[in-house]
Every structure is written in C-alpha cells, then in structure tokens.
Interface confidence: low
C-alpha cells in the first residue's frame, strides 16, 4: 500500500483550481474502512492501481484518501445530507493525479489517472449515516453506491431507502 507517501506529495495549489467551475468547500485526509472495520487499501500492480478491502495487521499503516467536498449545482431532493438545499459531493484521491471512478457498465470502482476538470464519474454524493458512517452514491447513476463485494469495491444498486443502511455500502472515515 502506498497511500501515506503518495498523499504527502499533495500541495495546496493542486487542489485550489476549480473543478467543473466549482472549488472544493474543504478537503479532508482520512483513511477509509468498511462498516466491519476492514481497510480500503491501494496498490500499484502492473502499472495500474488496484483497490483492496482487507484486514490490516496491527502495525500496518492505513492508506489515506484525500476527500474533496463540493456543493452540487442542483438542489437536493434529500433532507439532511445537503448543504443549504444542495447535495454535497466528494471526490476521492488516494495519490496524486488518481481518483476513484465509477464504471457503471462494469459495476466496478476503479482508480483512474486524469486531469481536471474531473469527469462526472469521479463525483459521489455523500450521504451522512448514523454511527459516523457515510455512503457514496454515484453522481452519474443515482441509486448506485460504492460498496464491498468479494473483498473489492464495486457498484451496488440500492433499490429502496430502507436499504441505505445495508452494511456493505457503509464506510467509516478516520484520521488515525
């Protein structure tokens, strides 16, 4: 896993430029883990980055992800997750120039190298759940969330609001 060293390469200037005409409200460096406390890790393999969901040993450092928060341009129909009636969206970047992307055709979550402005596939609507958990809904495919499937991240369709609390789409953010 490369997360810590990769994140240290960030500079403020990199993230001060506007993305699709919007600048981040704020940014936040955190490790990402599942509801069941498995860590989300990133590894360089064959010149591409792979994403894993795994148990870390006690002394292993968690990878960090830079979350950039944005206000959407469209009013939110939801209550509680919005910013003054607008949806709150995030991009997730574990290392410089790489962002998590939703591949809706393959129902997969991938790390892509890209330049700004970022494509819509890199934006996720952030839902604020109980017990310090969040979930990430695809901007490009409402009702589809980042989730855990077979020790990997995948896109999971949630067909009703009752299933929003399904454990496999809940994630924890931590600064340690």
């Amino acid at each position: 896993a490369f997360g810590i060293s990769g994140v240290q390469k960030y500079t403020r200037a990199l993230h001060d430029s506007s993305i699709t005409g919007i600048s981040p409200i704020t940014e936040y460096l955190a490790s990402l883990s599942t509801y069941n406390d498995q860590s989300i890790t990133f590894a360089l393999e064959d010149e591409s980055y792979e994403i894993y969901v795994e148990d870390l040993k006690k002394d292993e450092k968690k990878d960090k992800v830079l979350l950039s928060y944005y206000e959407s341009q469209h009013p939110s129909n939801e209550s509680g997750d919005g910013v003054d009636g607008k949806m709150l969206m995030v991009t997730l970047s574990p290392t410089k120039d790489f962002w998590l992307h939703a591949n809706n055709k393959e129902h997969s979550v991938e790390l892509h190298k890209c330049e700004k402005p970022l494509p819509d596939q890199a934006f996720f609507v952030l839902h604020n759940m109980h017990s310090n958990c969040v979930s990430f809904e695809c901007k490009t495919d409402p009702g589809v969330f980042i989730g855990v499937k077979d020790n990997h991240l995948a896109l999971i369709k949630v067909d009703s609001s009752e299933n929003l609390c399904t454990e496999n789409i809940l994630f924890k953010l931590s600064e340690t």
Epitope: I25, T26, Y28, A30, Y69, D81, G82, V83, D84, L88, L126, N128, N132, V134, L173, S174, E175
Partner: nanobody
Framework: QVQLVESGGGLVQPGGSLRLSCAAS????????MGWFRQAPGKEREFVAG????????LYADSVKGRFTISRDNAKNTVYLQMYSLKPEDAAVYYC????????????????WGQGTQVTVSS
C-alpha cells in the same frame, strides 16, 4: 456560511438538568469538530466541552467533568450538551461552536459560532 442554532436554554434550579441542542444548517460530518463554550457576565468566553469530528472522543473543562455530557448526531447535524447537577456558577450564555479541524478547545480557533442560548441557575 455555516449557521449554528442553539436551543434548550432556560431557567433551572440548582441541582437541576438541562439539555442544549445545536442544529447546523450545513453538513457537519466529517468536516467540523463541535463544541460548547460559555460566557458569564463580565467574564471571558470559556471552553466547556468538545467532541472530535470522526470519533466520539470528548473533552471537558475540569469544572464540568462528570456533570456535563456532549454528544452528536451526525445524521441530524446536531450536537447536544446534557447538563446535570447544575450550579449557580454554570449560569451563562452557552455558545455552540464549529472548527474545521479534528479537535476543538481553544476559543481562538473556532471557525463558526452560534448566537448563544441563556442558561440561568437560580432558586
């Protein structure tokens, strides 16, 4: 602009209890650490209690330890201060505060303040 709106203040007898609430108009978690401060007439604003933004770790002023409990409901964008065994010296205007950092505790580091709610402790 983050707006913090406090409620729950009022008049209570010594030994009584109150629960203060602070609702945020904008998304809190995980951007802001939240806290409560108070200011009595003629005194400086002081830290009462704080709660970290990504954990339930709490911090209290010595004067309220064991009597006050801070908590947050991230899904409701609300932070609470449950106050037990109130004393006359607890009387003050209580302010909700938010800081764009992991912890909160120093009055000078607060990014956003509520308008305050009055707590009066008198028989």
């Amino acid at each position: 602009q983050v707006q913090l709106v406090e409620s729950g203040g009022g008049l209570v007898q010594p030994g009584g209890s109150l629960r203060l609430s602070c609702a945020a108009s904008r998304f809190i978690f995980p951007i802001y650490a939240m806290g409560w401060f108070r200011q009595a007439p003629g005194k400086e604003r002081e830290f009462v209690a704080g709660i970290e933004r990504t954990t339930d770790t709490t911090l209290y002023a010595d004067s309220v330890k064991g009597r006050f409990t801070i908590s947050r409901d991230n899904a409701k964008n609300t932070v609470y201060l449950q106050m037990y065994s109130l004393k006359p010296e607890d009387a003050a205007v209580y302010y909700c505060a938010a800081r764009n950092s992991r912890r909160i505790g120093d009055v000078n580091d607060v990014d956003y303040w509520g308008q305050g709610t009055q707590v009066t402790v008198s028989s």
